[in-house]
């Protein structure tokens, strides 16, 4: 039978067994025993006596020094077997054993749930010698017990290379219910069932669970822990908690908010980061996600032009990062841009629209009718061309770029010249004689450099040769022009 020493009755389990000079003569009580000063070894050690443990784990002493009589086996005396107390109380318990004085060097160690207790514990072993025996009492005290102190404690004594083990002392720390699983915040679809779980443990058991929704109890009758609450569905946000009750009182879980998923709020603060002739880099601040993760976003682009047909271009992108480069736009155009994002419920409204413009583009066509001829008297090359028919979006012509490449006997050299937009002819100095000069021209706007014209080649002879007819840009489909001398 378990002897329970509740802390309400006694502050500590009392030393129950025989003490030196006053050994046990009566086995009617394990907790408090009358004592005399006589030594009664038959009572002290006999395994047939009631009220003391005989677990089989005993040391069998050898013959006494006189060699005449055998000493009985050694065993720890009975002590309280089960201590029940509340959290934060102090507790002390002990093991005691009477050892004949012929023995030397006895050590007692404490073990909890099979592991030796070392270090930072209040354990003391006290020795009380009498004429023939020494009472050894090992006490273990715990200040302000916690649940982690729950367990089975035993003493082990080593004596003459034998090990004696006490009966276990079960420490049961009782307190308010302790949650091992609390309900978690959730985001749920409107009118869709979901479950909440609550689990709490003692001791003492049982632990009963009540569910609370928005400060009102959900279940009239408690459920034994663990408890799963099935909510058939919500139409608006609610706060749930659970109450865990045991004989010591009640503990309330954290309150958790159950949110109803909705479409997101529209993004805000759409900003332009960079514009080129054909692209615009934008960013935005996501709106509230509606308690459901964003899946993707849609960038909507409308050209702001009375002559445009008002169609909207839609570019889908991931929800993160909150940035997108809109491409394939026309140069020097105005656009209205909005962003919308979606979650599992649906699309948000579109953000406030913002205006953005692309910059000038580079020309899309090369100068026309490029002709090249040699002016030998001045030792230069004359180049003429016609202004290309550029679109408005290419912006205003600011000039031309002339590339001339000189090739002779394994040497090649490219030179670039820039001329103003009002020119349609240029002169370049002859760089090398007895060489081929290849000329190409590109129109330039603020948006960049357009494509180069097809190359026109002219041979520059050695000094003293006569002028020849010019080379010119061939008609489309013809071979590269070459001046034949």
């Amino acid at each position: 039978a378990i002897t329970e020493a509740r802390e309400e009755a006694k502050p500590y389990p009392l030393f129950p067994g025989p003490l030196p000079g006053s050994l046990q003569t009566d086995h009617t009580s394990l907790l408090s025993l009358p004592h005399t000063s006589g030594y009664q070894p038959a009572l002290m050690f006999s395994p047939t006596q009631p009220g003391r443990p005989y677990t089989g784990n005993v040391a069998i002493p050898r013959v006494t020094s006189a060699g005449s009589k055998l000493l009985p086996p050694l065993a720890f005396k009975h002590t309280v077997g089960h201590i029940i107390l509340s959290e934060h109380k102090d507790v002390k318990f002990n093991c005691s054993i009477s050892v004949p004085n012929i023995y030397q060097d006895t050590t007692i160690s404490w073990w909890k749930d099979g592991k030796e207790l070392l270090g930072a514990h209040h354990a003391i072993t006290q020795f009380y010698p009498d004429d023939e025996v020494t009472a050894i009492i090992a006490s273990f005290s715990i200040t302000s017990v916690q649940r982690s102190d729950n367990g089975s404690y035993i003493c082990k004594m080593k004596i003459n290379n034998e090990e004696i083990v006490s009966d276990p002392i079960y420490i049961e720390v009782q307190g308010l219910p302790h949650f091992t699983k609390q309900p978690e915040s959730m985001n749920v679809t409107r009118n869709t069932a979901f479950n909440l779980t609550c689990q709490a443990v003692g001791p003492p058991e049982p632990v009963n669970i009540f569910w609370v929704q928005n400060s009102s109890r959900v279940n009239e009758q408690p459920e034994k822990s663990p408890s799963v609450l099935t909510v058939p569905g919500l139409t608006e946000m609610a706060v749930f908690s659970c109450e865990a009750h045991n004989d010591k009182g009640l503990t309330v879980s954290k309150g958790v908010q159950i949110n109803i998923k909705a479409i997101p709020s529209p993004p805000t603060e759409v900003s332009i980061h960079n514009s080129t002739a054909h692209s615009i880099l934008i960013s935005w601040v996501p709106g509230f996600d509606g308690y459901s993760p964003f899946r993707n976003c849609s960038v909507q682009v409308k050209e702001v032009d009375p002559l445009s047909n008002g169609s909207v271009m839609i570019f889908n992108t991931s929800a993160s990062p909150h940035m997108y480069q809109i491409k394939q736009l026309q140069a020097l155009a105005n656009y209205s841009i909005g962003v919308s994002c979606m979650n599992e419920i649906g699309w948000s409204a579109v953000s406030p629209w913002i205006l953005a413009s692309t910059t000038e583009g580079a020309p899309s066509v090369a100068p026309l009718n490029v002709t090249v001829f040699l002016n030998e008297s001045r030792d230069n090359v004359d180049i003429r061309w016609m202004k290309p028919l550029t679109k408005r979006q290419a912006g205003e012509l600011v000039g031309y770029r002339i590339s001339h490449v000189w090739q002779s006997a394994g040497i090649s050299k490219e030179l670039l010249e820039e001329v103003g937009q009002n020119n349609s002819r240029a002169q370049i100095s002859v760089q090398v004689h007895n060489a081929t000069c290849t000329v190409r021209i590109a129109a330039v706007t603020k948006g960049g450099v357009g494509p180069f014209s097809d190359p026109v080649k002219i041979f520059i002879p050695a000094h003293g040769w006569v002028d020849h007819a010019p080379s010119s840009t061939p008609a489309p489909g013809n071979a590269d022009p070459v001046l034949i001398i």
Epitope: F15, S32, P34, H35, Q126
Partner: antibody
Framework: QLQLQESGPGLVKPSETLSLTCAVS?????????WGWIRQSPGKGLEWIGS???????YYSPSLKSRVTISVDTSKNQFSLKLNSVTAADTADYYC???????????????WGQGTLVTVSS | AIQLTQSPSSLSASVGDRVTITCRAS??????LAWYQQKPGKAPKVLIY???SLESGVPSRFSGSGSGTDFTLTISSLQPEDFATYYC????????FGQGTKVEIK
């Protein structure tokens, strides 16, 4: 709070029995702890005599064991000391005290009574 | 029985001095030692238990240390009310006391 008060004759004849009682107030002896007697000869150090718990379990000093009896009366919340065959060497201040059980079975003494002087003389 | 030997038997010191009293046990007693202060005509009062734990209400200038056989009581800055006799007591076995150290005014 817990208080202890010694009482008994201040003069005992040699070879007779010294008897003292310690009354405990502010605490029930039955609640636990050992209750001890300590003496202090004039100008000398402290000597533990013995201790008793609420059930009558006793510890005695090995040097005095043959002459000492300590008993408890829980109904009166008191405990007593009897020391027989006294001699002049037993003249001392006798203190009763609670033996704390915070660490072990008998630890330090706290609190103490104020003490009573017993003289052994014919 | 376990014998406790205190040293010195007596000492003279001034207010503000640091005072150290030692207690040696005849065999190992772990940390099962207490220190007491006794003033003339009064009962002893516990200062330190478990060799180094300060009893509630005792000024922090008192401290204890040691384990096994050698123990020390230190008064960091002696005050007028500290002139008294100090005793150590072991509780590893039957309680025994040291012979006492008397702290007197220099």
């Amino acid at each position: 709070q817990l208080q202890l008060q010694e009482s008994g004759p201040g003069l005992v004849k040699p070879s007779e029995t010294l008897s003292l009682t310690c009354a405990v107030s502010g605490y029930s002896i039955s609640s636990g702890n050992y209750w001890g007697w300590i003496r202090q000869s004039p100008g000398k150090g402290l000597e533990w005599i013995g201790s008793v718990d609420h059930s009558g379990s006793t510890y005695y000093s090995p040097s005095l064991k043959s002459r000492v009896t300590i008993s408890v009366d829980t109904s009166k919340n008191q405990f007593s000391l009897k020391l027989n065959s006294v001699t002049a060497a037993d003249t001392a201040d006798y203190y009763c005290a609670r033996n704390t059980m915070i660490r072990g079975v008998m630890d330090w003494f706290d609190p103490w009574g104020q003490g009573t002087l017993v003289t052994v003389s014919s | 029985a376990i014998q406790l030997t205190q040293s010195p038997s007596s000492l003279s010191a001034s207010v503000g001095d640091r005072v150290t009293i030692t207690c040696r046990a005849s065999q190992g007693i772990s940390s099962a030692l207490a220190w007491y202060q006794q003033k003339p005509g009064k009962a002893p009062k516990v200062l330190i238990y478990d060799a180094s734990s300060l009893e509630s209400g005792v000024p922090s200038r008192f401290s204890g240390s040691g384990s096994g056989t050698d123990f020390t009581l230190t008064i960091s800055s002696l005050q007028p009310e500290d002139f008294a006799t100090y005793y150590c007591q072991q509780f590893r076995s039957y309680p025994t006391f040291g012979q006492g150290t008397k702290v007197e005014i220099k």
